[in-house]
């Protein structure tokens, strides 16, 4: 997250970290069910671990943390590497979470976002770009949803209805390492960090997010079929 600020503790209990061994964070994710996460399809790895209820980036033990294995990862069948359409994936955890003030699911919004909606994006991704500098704790950033026209103008022939753009002033954006993390609007999960320009936070080059309102049926049916 570029030019965000430290999230208040306990305010993002649905935020998950996907880790490669030994403790290398490579993507964010979102708890949407007691045993299921959503993340970006481009975050798929065969071997990874899931950390929930953790505030700092470092692997130091925190009393609220819960660790999991992913037993099943189900990318949306319409995703096409290295493209960006349908960039979402469900991950089934090896057990249900223990609900606490630090670990709690969030509902996926069934309403599509309208331009001007205020949202919050969070993650442990780099705080500088093109340099790489990772934060000590989870970062939060207020962003506004842009109109689909402004989104298409920013990225001609690259935007479809499975994506939406959001941003703020130049210099504020999600970035590498935030992928798969949540965009929360009006208390519901509206999007996942998907892609954007490089370097991040360039003027008139907003962040692009998976438009989850288009996928509520697929999410529900996939969870039911695999529970």
């Amino acid at each position: 997250i570029i030019n965000g600020s430290d999230c208040d503790m306990h305010t993002q209990p649905w935020q998950a970290a996907l880790l490669l061994r030994p403790n290398q964070l490579y993507c964010g994710a979102v708890l949407v069910h007691p045993q299921w996460l959503l993340t970006a399809a481009h975050c798929r790895k065969k071997v990874f671990r899931v950390r929930l209820g953790h505030y700092s980036l470092s692997p130091v033990y925190e009393s609220g943390q819960q660790m999991f294995q992913g037993v099943k990862s189900i990318p949306h069948p319409g995703y096409s590497h290295p493209g960006h359409s349908n960039d979402l994936m469900l991950i089934k955890l090896n057990r249900r979470i223990r609900p606490t003030k630090d670990v709690r699911p969030i509902n996926v919004s069934s309403h599509c976002p309208s331009a001007g909606t205020k949202c919050l994006v969070s993650g442990w991704g780099t705080t500088k770009s093109p340099q790489v500098h990772f934060p000590k704790v989870l970062q939060c950033l207020n962003i506004s949803v842009l109109s689909q026209k402004r989104c298409e103008d920013a990225y001609p022939r690259q935007i479809d209805d499975t994506m939406f753009c959001a941003g703020d002033k130049a210099g504020r954006d999600s970035c590498q390492g935030d992928s798969g993390g949540p965009v929360v609007c009006n208390g519901s999960l509206q999007g996942l960090v998907s892609w954007g320009d490089y370097p991040c936070a360039r003027p008139n080059r907003p962040g692009v997010y998976t438009n989850l309102c288009k996928f509520t049926k697929w999410i529900q049916e996939t969870i039911q079929a695999n529970s």
Epitope: R21, K46, V47, I74, Y79, S80, H81, P82
Partner: antibody, heavy 117, light 110 residues
Framework: EVQLQESGPGLVKPSGTLSLTCAVS????????MSWVRQPPGKGLEWIGD???????DYASWAKGRVTISQDSSKNQVSLKLSSVTAADTAVYYC???????????WGQGTLVTVSS | AYDMTQSPSSLSASVGDRVTITCQAS??????LAWYQQKPGKAPKLLIY???TLASGVPSRFSGSGSGTDFTLTISSLQPEDFATYYC????????????FGGGTKVEIK
């Protein structure tokens, strides 16, 4: 050097159990999923199953109930057991490492197991 | 089931030819497809993963494309060392799968 080496009896009697081990060197099992694949003489590749560092195991549908895959991280080895074998299980058996992007990037040299009385 | 069908099962070609092998999945596997090359008496070798990403050390004459159900392996200019059997493998799911591999395509000298 990253290396995989399968070993086990080359001959197994019908209705017996085929047991193979895959010795892993040059990388820790804790970081990778491992696969077993077989190839009957003159035929194509057949996936048997995968084992993850967390000991989660996925088997081919034909192998469920007959195959057991396990690992010993302290010895850095993976094992395959196939019970109630018949002549149709005669094949070269390979272990392989997944590159974490769903491609098998390191393979053992394979070991031929013949099922015959 | 996610069945993988390769075609052709064999083909004859000359050095320098452009060769195309196809792999079709019975359901969408998104981009989780790998290609392997196998020579007689040897273990398979990974060529391409994620449908189009070239594995380390693989010559650039090999390329992969496709997504969903239809995939292609192309050898832009066939070399003598490329005569072998090629297999595709899906990595989209391991659940209730008979075989993740396609049946293979043997590339022979014309």
């Amino acid at each position: 050097e990253v290396q995989l080496q399968e070993s086990g009896p080359g001959l197994v009697k019908p209705s017996g159990t085929l047991s193979l081990t895959c010795a892993v060197s040059g990388f820790p099992l804790s970081n990778y999923a491992m696969s077993w694949v077989r190839q009957p003489p003159g035929k194509g590749l057949e996936w048997i199953g995968d084992i993850y560092p967390s000991d989660i195991i996925d088997y081919a549908s034909w192998a469920k109930g007959r195959v057991t895959i396990s690992q010993d991280s302290s010895k850095n080895q993976v094992s395959l057991k196939l019970s109630s074998v018949t002549a149709a299980d005669t094949a070269v058996y390979y272990c392989a490492r997944d590159n974490n992007d769903y491609g098998l990037d390191i393979w053992g040299q394979g070991t031929l197991v013949t099922v015959s009385s | 089931a996610y069945d993988m069908t390769q075609s052709p099962s064999s083909l004859s070609a000359s050095v320098g030819d452009r060769v195309t092998i196809t792999c079709q999945a019975s359901q969408s596997i998104s981009s989780w497809l790998a290609w392997y090359q196998q020579k007689p008496g040897k273990a398979p070798k990974l060529l391409i993963y994620l449908a189009s990403t070239l594995a380390s050390g693989v010559p650039s004459r090999f390329s992969g494309s496709g997504s969903g159900t239809d995939f292609t392996l192309t050898i832009s200019s066939l070399q003598p060392e490329d005569f072998a059997t090629y297999y595709c493998q899906q990595g989209y799911t391991d659940s209730n799968i008979i075989n993740t591999f396609g049946g293979g395509t043997k590339v022979e000298i014309k």
